[in-house]
Amino acid sequence: DFGLDCDEHSTESRCCRYPLTVDFEAFGWDWIIAPKRYKANYCSGECEFVFLQKYPHTHLVHQANPRGSAGPCCTPTKMSPINMLYFNGKEQIIYGKIPAMVVDRCGCS
Amino acid sequence: DFGLDCDEHSTESRCCRYPLTVDFEAFGWDWIIAPKRYKANYCSGECEFVFLQKYPHTHLVHQANPRGSAGPCCTPTKMSPINMLYFNGKEQIIYGKIPAMVVDRCGCS
């Protein structure tokens, strides 16, 4: 189970993980105390048949070719959490592990 | 965390889970002893902004709008295994739980 890593200079057209730093302050998300920014990454690229398919199911749906099923798309296949300190809606400061904030791997599903 | 369920008569255009029975015999996958067919389901539909987004990350990437990032796509967000009996490449009969064969929920990611 692997995925491609690319950067802004890459010529790769296939599904790939690209670096992206999310800046909460720039978004005006002022309820987030920390981190103010973090490396989130994102997925982009084409999903040719079978390339980086995460699930056997993806292949089976392609074979069955039901009405309206699009081809697989380039999407996160492995994600990880980050620890965040933030204000909730009750003015309380909350510390918690927020799941699925970082893309570790991209694939076609 | 929920997802829409549709069928072939639905007029829903948004990301939805549709029924799909996979027939291994029809595919010519004769190394599979059992099941010969099973309910796999599949995902199809449009991902309007924020609708059924599985991860906060999806929203953040939309905000950051990096080069080449497509919008979220309708993809499995919860899957389950099935038990299968099959021949492996060494002519042995194997019984095992095969992960991610059934789509339980669809979402935008």
Epitope: W31, A34, K36, N83, L85, E91, I93, Y95 | -
Partner: antibody, heavy 113, light 108 residues
Framework: EVQLVESGGGLVQPGGSLRLSCAAS????????MSWVRQAPGKGLEWVSA????????YYSDTVKGRFTISRDNAKNTLYLQMNSLRAEDTAVYYC??????WGQGTLVTVSS | EIVLTQSPGTLSLSPGERATLSCRAS???????LHWYAAKPGQAPRLLIY???NLVAGIPDRFSGSGSGTDFTLTISRLEPEDFAVYYC?????????FGGGTKVEIK
């Protein structure tokens, strides 16, 4: 960019009064509790007072309770600290803060005869 | 009311050396709400580490935090000239904030 700018500091005699202001920008001011923190010359940081987002509840350290009053005007994005019965030991740089992350640069209050 | 005691009061070290700063709470506190700041003369305090061990974005990774219960530590693995400052631990409970007395890290 979040900015907290304190004003109103200065020299005052013991027993006198002073009102500090803190103008907030770049922050949804009305959504958050705000605090005053001070630092006396050569001493450490001391939390002084806090106020809820609506201004409905206020909190004070024992050293200032009964003498200082914290308030806010959300329409003006401004936090206040009314200081009465000032003592020499109240001499400090007073910081306005949305703890723990956003702080102003501070305003100096000197209590001396 | 929680009291935070920092030690030593002053730490005299040379650039390149390791600094270990202690913060002890009078009773057990939540590690989620124990933070560290750096303060320099004429500047507002700056949040360095949040929730005991998480580095704030932009803070060099030579800074690290650890601890639980009543004992917490800030470590600077190799002191740089810009690291000489006063460091404070701070605890949050409800709307009350408690600061430690500070540790001054000075050039030897």
């Amino acid at each position: 960019e979040v900015q907290l700018v304190e004003s109103g500091g200065g020299l005052v005699q013991p027993g006198g009064s002073l009102r500090l202001s803190c103008a907030a920008s770049g922050l949804t001011f009305s959504r958050y509790p705000m605090s005053w923190v001070r630092q006396a010359p050569g001493k450490g940081l001391e939390w002084v007072s806090a106020i809820t987002s609506s201004g409905g509840s206020t909190y004070y350290s024992d050293t200032v309770k009964g003498r200082f009053t914290i308030s806010r005007d959300n329409a003006k994005n401004t936090l206040y600290l009314q200081m009465n019965s000032l003592r020499a030991e109240d001499t400090a740089v007073y910081y306005c803060a949305r703890l723990p992350d956003y702080w102003g640069q501070g305003t100096l209050v000197t209590v001396s005869s | 009311e929680i009291v935070l005691t920092q030690s030593p009061g002053t730490l005299s070290l040379s650039p390149g050396e390791r600094a270990t700063l202690s913060c002890r709470a009078s009773s057990s506190v939540s590690s989620s709400y124990l933070h560290w700041y750096a303060a320099k003369p004429g500047q507002a305090p700056r949040l360095l580490i949040y929730s005991t061990s998480n580095l704030v974005a932009g803070i060099p990774d030579r800074f690290s935090g650890s601890g639980s219960g009543t004992d917490f530590t800030l470590t600077i693995s190799r002191l740089e000239p810009e690291d000489f400052a006063v460091y404070y631990c701070q605890h949050y409970s409800g709307y009350h904030f408690t600061f430690g007395g500070g540790t001054k890290v000075e050039i030897k």
